[in-house]
Each structure stands twice: as C-alpha cells, then as structure tokens.
C-alpha cells in the first residue's frame, strides 16, 4: 500500500533543493500543480503553481521557486534555489481539480535549512555546487485564490528521533514516517 | 545484500508481449525509483522509464508510450516492465536500476540487476 | 531532447597511461552529469555522480570534472581491469540521455 512519507532534506543556506512529485500522468497530465508550505495549525500556503492548463516542461519561476512539469512522463520536478534559514519548513505537492478538492502528491518534504558556506560542503554532502541558470523564457502564473477548509492539514508532530539512513524507517503512531535524506545541492 | 535480480531471457515472436521481472532486495523497496534502460546488442544504454514503487506512479519516454507498462508488487519487492507488440528491433538487454530517492531529483543508478536477453525473432 | 556527444568513440592505451574521455551535452546540464563503467557481458555501474563526485568503493584514479555544457572523465593511471566502455549520463532534463560510450581497450 501507498504510505505517506515525510522526507528531510537538509540543505545550507544558498544551495537548491531540487525535488520532484510525481502524480498518475493519464488523470492529471494537464492540471495545475501547486508547491505548497504547511504551517503549524495553519492552511497550506501556495507559493508558485504551473499554468492552467499546465504547460508541458514549460518552466515556471515565482521568486526562488521554479517548477517544471513533465506532462509525458508524470512528474512535477521543483527547484528551490538560493535557499535562505528561514525557507525550513514543510512542503508539498497539491493538484488542482476545481471544484473538488486539490489532490496532494507524495511526499512531503520537511526542507531544514542551515547557516554555513554552500561552498564548503558538509561530510555528507556532494563537493558540487549546482549554479541553476534559469532560461529567461520562465512564465509567473497566477494560483487559485481559493482555499478549502478541508485542506486545513495538521502538520506532523515533530520527532525526536534522528533516523541516519534512508533505510532505518521508523514507523510512529498517527506520524508520517520521517527519512532523513543525504543532503543534495 | 543489495540487489536487483531480473527474471530470464525470453525469445518471442514479433507482435507478442514480454513481462519482464525485477526483485529487490536489501533495501527498502518504496524508498527508490526504479529505471528501466535497454541495451541493443553492441549498442548504447537507452533509458525507457521510471517507476516510483510507493505511489506505484510511472512515466515512459515517448518512444515507449503505449507499449511499455511499468507496474510493481510491494510484498515482494517486485518491479515489473511488460512490452507488447514486439518487433525485431526490440531485441536488447533490458536492465532494471535504482534510481535516487523517490522524492529527489537524482537520477543516477547506483544498482543494476544482471539484465534479462529478449529476443524477437520469427 | 538533450544530445550527448562522447568522444572519441573507442581508444587503445597502454598500462599506466593517464586516459581522457570528454562529454559534451547540447545545452547547459547544471552539472546533472553521471559515468558509468560497463565491462563486456555485464551491468553497467555508476563510477561518478554530479560530474566530480566518486561512487563509493571506487578506486580513486577514476575522476570526473567540467561544467556548462563540456565535461571530462579521467584514469590517472589505467589499469588492466579498466577495460570497458564508458558512458556519460545527463539528468537535467527529461528524458535522461546517454553519450554513445567510449571503448577503452589496452595496447
């Protein structure tokens, strides 16, 4: 079965996360795809979202936030570069599917950003720092006004445990499993 | 041990369908994508998709569309990839490999099964 | 889709010889590039990750560097058992392409 995750990333300030989502190509090839933060006890907050109807790896760029969807092979890739301390938090895909509610995609990032120099990596860092050139052909598309209540989500309680490998899975009552991801740039 | 362990070579007749099969082992089998890549007799590595075995989510180069289908089976551990319609020029080494984290866009192999010999021939 | 040029196509080189195989990509690849090392009858295997970054277990005389568009894959010193041939792999965009490999024989 399907399990919703929650994966970290640990990054330093000024490096990329670059992640993807990936949904069922046939049923939301061309919808429109959102990066969403989730707050405590908060709504989820849309950052940046793809055209509608979505545009096949068409890049889009919203500040920092750049997404690209690959409508032919079902992926919705998200680039967020030069992060800063205060981009920690969690994140997630969502499809919009109006009027019914937006279809979230697995999985959610928890994204811990660090102070330090993204030049000098840490020991489990790769020695590459990737210096994203975005072509300047990216479109600003506007995201839905609209937010249901039923998507209020209450964000998992922060663990304590510090799982080292992304095969120690630890399974915690009513918590989405938490892997710690090796730190990508 | 880590591993990827693909079924047999086949040798099937043009127009049939090939199912090809994929074991996991020594890893957590829904913590990474798996690839499909072709090898053509003294030819290059061409990658035809991606598999994620959590969400069961696949996607396909356009080359591949329509005939290629990427399904999994969490309690084994099994990815599978079944091409129909077969012609000669299907003939190849088919590898199944680990990709990067399901979530991450990291997409290098770090583990490849032995690959399996398909051969269309009438 | 992204091209990948590797050249040259094959090479002869003797025991000891430092070997250079370059990688060019069609447009810039943001250093999404991989090297993989495939011996004859076998898998391929990943040699280097992110253009620079060695593969655990893989013996240090194997090196990758470049940037933009231009890429190059080094043997310090070329060994016996380095009999293969190599192939270069972008990630930045989809579909993921290969270079057309490199066999490395010995004189």
């Known amino acids: 079965a399907t399990k919703l995750t929650e994966e970290k990333y640990e990054l330093k300030e000024g490096q990329t996360l670059d992640v993807k989502c990936d949904y069922t190509l046939e049923k939301f090839a061309s919808s429109q795809k959102a990066w969403q933060i989730i707050r405590d006890g908060e709504m989820p907050k849309t950052l940046a979202c793809t055209e509608r109807p979505s545009k096949n790896s068409h890049p889009v760029q919203v500040g920092r936030i750049i997404l690209e969807d690959y409508h032919d092979h079902g992926l919705l890739r998200v680039r967020m570069v030069n992060l800063q301390v205060e981009d920690s938090g969690l994140y997630q895909c969502v499809i919009y599917q109006p009027p019914k509610e937006p279809h979230m995609l697995f999985d959610r990032i928890r994204l811990v950003v660090t102070k330090g120099f993204s030049g000098t990596p840490g020991s489990n860092e790769n020695s590459t720092q990737n210096v994203y050139k975005i072509p300047p052909t990216t479109t600003k598309a506007l995201c839905p006004l609209y937010t249901s209540p039923r998507t209020v989500t209450q964000a998992p309680p922060k663990s304590t445990a510090d799982v080292s490998t992304p095969d120690s899975e630890i399974n915690l009552t009513n918590v989405t499993d938490i892997i710690r991801v090796p730190v990508f740039n | 041990q880590v591993q990827l362990v693909q079924s047999g070579a086949e040798v099937k007749k043009p127009g049939a369908s090939v199912k090809v099969s994929c074991k996991a082992s020594?890893?957590?089998?829904?913590?990474?994508?798996i690839n499909w890549v072709r090898q053509a007799t003294g030819q290059g590595l061409e990658w035809m998709g991606w598999?994620?075995?959590?969400?069961?989510?696949?996607g396909q180069t356009q080359k591949f569309r329509g005939r290629v289908t990427m399904t999994r089976d969490t309690s084994i551990s099994t990815a599978y990839m079944e091409l129909s319609s077969l012609r000669s020029e299907d003939t190849a080494v088919y590898y199944c490999?680990?990709?990067?984290?399901?979530?991450?866009?990291?997409?290098?192999?770090?583990?490849w099964g032995r690959g399996t010999l398909v051969t269309v021939s009438s | 889709d992204i091209q990948m040029t590797q050249s040259p196509s094959s090479l002869s080189a003797s025991v000891g010889d430092r070997v250079t195989i370059t990688c060019q990509a069609s447009?810039?690849?943001?250093?999404?590039l991989n090297w993989y090392q495939q011996k004859p009858g076998k898998a391929p295997k990943l040699l280097i990750y992110?253009?620079?970054n060695l593969e655990t277990g893989v013996p240090s005389r194997f090196s990758g560097s470049g940037s933009g568009t231009d890429f190059t894959f080094t043997i310090s010193s070329l060994q016996p058992e380095d009999i293969a041939t190599y192939y270069c792999?972008?990630?930045?965009?989809?579909?993921?392409?290969f270079g057309g490999g490199t066999k490395v024989e010995i004189k």
């Open positions: 992110d253009v620079s």
């Open positions: 020594g890893y957590t089998f829904t913590r990474y994508d």
């Open positions: 490999a680990r990709g990067g984290y399901t979530s991450a866009w990291r997409w290098y192999f770090d583990l």
């Open positions: 598999l994620n075995p959590n969400s069961g989510n696949t």
């Open positions: 447009q810039d690849i943001n250093n999404h």
């Open positions: 792999q972008q990630y930045d965009k989809l579909p993921l392409t």
